[in-house]
Interface confidence: low
């Protein structure tokens, strides 16, 4: 995981795979790490536009395609501090990226397994 430099307020955006470069069909995990208490609501922004997702500190992008490429950041909203935006990270989808082990495979038992 890469820890992007965070502002003094302590919000960091972690990206896996390292460098944000992933092969088509791979999975990207973005984690918004905030030191605030209580944990604030976290929303996500892609290329400057809010993503229509429920608040969550973890953004999972499974089976990525080129439409998932872009610049991502997270915004943490705390009632007493207002919104804080993380440094952005760039996600690139390329054949030379890290596809990682297969996830969500279904074995002979019929049970889905975590890779």
């Amino acid at each position: 995981r890469v820890r992007e430099p965070g502002p003094p307020e302590g919000i960091q955006l972690l990206v896996e795979p390292e460098g944000g470069i992933v092969a088509p069909g791979g999975t990207v995990t973005l984690t918004c790490a905030i030191s605030a208490q209580p944990p604030p609501q976290v929303h996500w922004i892609k290329d400057g536009a809010p993503l229509p997702l429920a608040p969550s500190p973890v953004l999972l992008l499974p089976e990525v395609g080129h439409e998932d490429e872009g610049t991502y950041s997270c915004v943490a909203t705390h009632p007493s501090h207002g919104p804080q935006e993380s440094p952005p990270v760039s996600i690139r989808v390329t054949e030379t990226g890290d596809e990682g082990p297969a996830e969500g495979s279904v074995g002979e038992s019929g049970l889905g397994t975590l890779a």
Partner: nanobody, 116 residues
Framework: QVQLVQSGGGLVQAGGSLRLSCAAS????????MGWYRQAPGKQREWVTT???????DYAASVKGRFTISRDTAKNAVYLQMNNLKPEDTARYYC??????????WGQGTQVTVSS
């Protein structure tokens, strides 16, 4: 119909430990993450921790260093080891399984009460 069966809650004194378990009762495909959430009386449900398909874990700041998430891939099970429990950890704990292309599964919840 798949159900998530939770166990392991209960009453514990501050500073004590509990281990929560959550297992799928049927066939579950396309899992890409598992996690735990909690809801205290009169409050919104809040995220606690997540483990992704590649084993990446993350924790809410309030539990980091005290709680540990783990999984058993063969059983489609996820666990939450809770140490050094505090009264503010009192809540109903829910497990969640995220599936690629499907709505997530939620457990029925298990009560954890930490007395001072």
């Amino acid at each position: 119909q798949v159900q998530l069966v939770q166990s392991g809650g209960g009453l514990v004194q501050a500073g004590g430990s509990l281990r929560l378990s959550c297992a799928a009762s049927g066939s579950v495909s396309s899992i890409y993450a598992m996690g735990w959430y909690r809801q205290a009386p009169g409050k919104q449900r809040e995220w606690v921790t997540t483990i992704t398909g590649r084993g990446i874990t993350d924790y809410a700041a309030s539990v980091k260093g005290r709680f540990t998430i783990s999984r058993d891939t063969a059983k489609n099970a996820v666990y939450l080891q809770m140490n050094n429990l505090k009264p503010e950890d009192t809540a109903r704990y829910y497990c969640k399984i995220d599936r690629r292309g499907y709505a997530p599964y939620w457990g029925q919840g298990t009560q954890v009460t930490v007395s001072s």
